[in-house]
């Protein structure tokens, strides 16, 4: 069980010629809302598929009316986080599909608009209890920039919040780095709430506000390793003679890192992000001034404003991290387009394009979507080596720039006569014939063969609420 | 595609009551409005009452306003019409419409891309 949480930062026109002005220009007031929708696994294919993981809905955005001199504020957002609940495992291989849609409040005729401003979706890897990951994407002219991540609840651990189980209060025989642990049982009873940053994995107390350390540990947070012990070389879940839990699949249960450092893991291990004024594989130590040295990779330091940071490191390109200890991971940068596979080479980013997108960072569009804009609200579709705008109600031609005559085409039959009206056309049928395009011809005795369609207008009535 | 089917039409006395019922099957997940229409012999088709799916949002026409009013069930594939205070120009053919449209305008029959067969309520006085 857990939760994954989405956080939108901003929604907004992208940059480049062409993008709208906001989403309510020349529409009256408008306010935005978002919808997250969760599938597991990596697959295209399931695009019609429901929300298997869970979906969610934000909070309306504040009413926005654009100022037609003033310059475009940044949008109103709706408040808070997006929480979608998952009750089994976390699949670590999901899809991300995000909506943004727009409520319009002026007075239409045909009552309120609601319009879907732009769709996102992002297939991804991740893992439950990691921190948030930052994201930036384009849908036509918008762009949206968010965070997400997953974590558990309820007392599920691991990066698929599978295990459930809690540690003990109590010491036990269990050497250095195995940690002993209850199953989830009524009589688990809740430790006691110890001192600060006192090493959940390596520490313990009786009494509220004490850190006792496991064997094999010392410092006054438990976060010091203290000798080697035969124990160490356990594998598997539990040791028959001591009853001990081996730490499983998930390096960061309990979170190793002190000092309010946060935990994420790597292939066998973790790593701690340390809080300013802390670096260590813990972040144990403490007290650090830059005449500590404490910048690595060549890191400038500069000694902090404030009380709580003693020093701040300003990493050079490539490194990160409060303490510049880690190698940027390029490709969690995404700076593969329209769904590219990353690599990360060493010496250069490669990107392995999906089919129909080409380039170094996939951003050619081989059908010619890319920077082709539809105008007045209409949306590109790929296909067929050449792009097509799917236009708006009311627009037409290939850029959707020309307001389209639905009558062109003569679509009433039978003598009907045709009117163009904002979203589509009428038919006033004439005498004997009745539907939306007067095709069906009414029966001598009043009653018509209907479709499954709703019925249209009787003889001369023309349809004016369409 | 999304189907619909009405029932809970009938004859009934002005100042009574009914509720229609749409159960909506096949892609469903999918959609983003339901809501009734109604046609009345010689007049125009007319937007009666409305539920926007993605906000739990709720819409009247005028002359239903007060007396009618549309919810929809737990799993969001059913739409519940109760129709109180009924008076003899509530008589029509009515039907139930669905979208799964990007864009709609809520009181707006070309916004419905799924409608139902219809079920007729007569109010007589």
């Known amino acids: 069980a857990g939760v994954f949480e989405l956080q939108i930062h901003s929604f907004g026109p992208g940059p480049g010629p062409g993008a709208p002005r906001s989403p309510c220009s020349a529409r009256g007031p408008c306010r935005l809302f978002f919808r997250v929708c969760l599938k597991p696994g990596l697959s295209e294919e399931a695009a019609e598929s429901p929300c298997a993981l869970g979906a969610a809905l934000s909070a309306r955005g504040p009413v926005y009316t654009e100022q037609p001199e003033a310059p475009a504020p940044d949008l109103p957002l709706p408040n808070g986080l997006l929480q979608v609940p998952f009750r089994d495992a976390w699949p670590g291989t999901f899809s991300l599909i995000i909506e943004t849609w727009r409520e319009e409040l002026g007075d239409q005729i045909g009552g309120p608009a609601w319009s879907l401003l732009a769709r996102v979706t992002r297939r991804r890897r991740l893992a439950a209890g990691g921190p948030w990951a930052r994201d930036i994407q384009r849908a036509g002219a918008w762009e949206l920039r968010f965070s997400y991540r997953a974590r558990c609840e309820l007392l599920a651990v691991g990066t698929a919040c599978t295990r459930l189980c809690r540690p003990r209060s109590a010491p036990s025989r269990c050497g250095p780095g195995l940690r002993p642990c209850a199953p989830l049982e009524d009589e688990c009873e809740a430790p006691p709430v110890c001192r600060a940053g006192c090493s959940l994995e390596h520490g313990f107390c009786e009494q509220p506000g004490e850190c006792r350390c496991l064997e094999g540990w010392t410092g006054p947070l438990c976060t010091v390793p203290a000798s080697t012990s035969s124990c160490l070389g356990l594998r598997g879940p539990s040791s028959a003679t001591t009853g001990c839990l081996v730490p499983g699949p998930g390096p960061c249960d309990g979170n190793p890192c002190a000092n309010g450092g946060s935990c994420s893991e790597t292939p066998g291990s973790f790593e701690c992000t340390c809080p300013r004024g802390f670096y260590g594989l813990r972040c144990e130590v403490s007290g650090v001034t830059c005449a500590d040295g404490p910048c690595f990779n060549g890191g400038l330091c500069v000694g902090g404003a404030d009380p709580d940071s003693a020093y701040i490191c300003h990493c050079p390109p490539g490194f990160q991290g409060s303490n510049c200890e880690k190698r940027v991971d390029r490709c969690s940068l995404q700076p593969c387009r329209n769904g590219g596979l990353c690599l990360d080479l060493g010496h250069a980013l490669r990107c392995r394009c999906r089919a129909g997108f080409a380039g170094p960072r996939c951003e050619h569009n081989l059908d010619d979507c890319a920077g082709r804009a539809c105008a007045n609200g209409g949306t590109c579709v790929e296909g067929g080596g050449a792009h097509r705008c799917s236009c708006a109600l009311g627009f037409g031609g290939r850029d959707c720039r020309e307001r389209a005559d639905p009558c062109a085409a003569r679509p009433c039959a039978h003598g009907g006569r045709c009117y163009a009206h904002f979203s589509g056309l009428v038919c006033a049928c004439a005498p004997g014939y009745m539907g939306s395009r007067c095709e069906f011809p009414v029966h001598p005795d009043g009653v018509s063969a209907l479709p499954a369609a709703p019925p249209g207008l009787r003889p001369g009535d023309p349809q004016r609420y369409l | 595609q999304v189907h619909l089917m009405e029932s809970g039409g009938g004859s009934v006395q002005a100042g009574g009551s009914l509720r229609l019922s749409c159960v909506a099957s096949g892609n469903t997940y999918r959609l983003n409005s339901m809501g009734w229409f109604r046609q009345a012999p010689g007049k125009e088709r007319e937007g009666v009452a409305f539920i926007v799916m993605i906000r739990g949002t709720t819409y009247y026409g005028a002359s239903v306003k007060g007396r009618f009013t549309i919810s929809q069930d737990n799993a969001q594939t059913t739409v519940y019409l109760q129709m109180s205070s009924l008076k003899p120009e509530d008589t029509a053919m009515y039907y139930c419409?669905?979208?799964?449209?990007?864009?709609?305008?809520?009181?707006?029959?070309?916004?419905?891309?799924?409608w139902g067969q219809g079920t007729q309520v007569t109010v007589s006085s």
């Open positions: 419409a669905a979208s799964t449209k990007d864009q709609f305008y809520v009181f707006n029959p070309i916004g419905y891309d799924s």
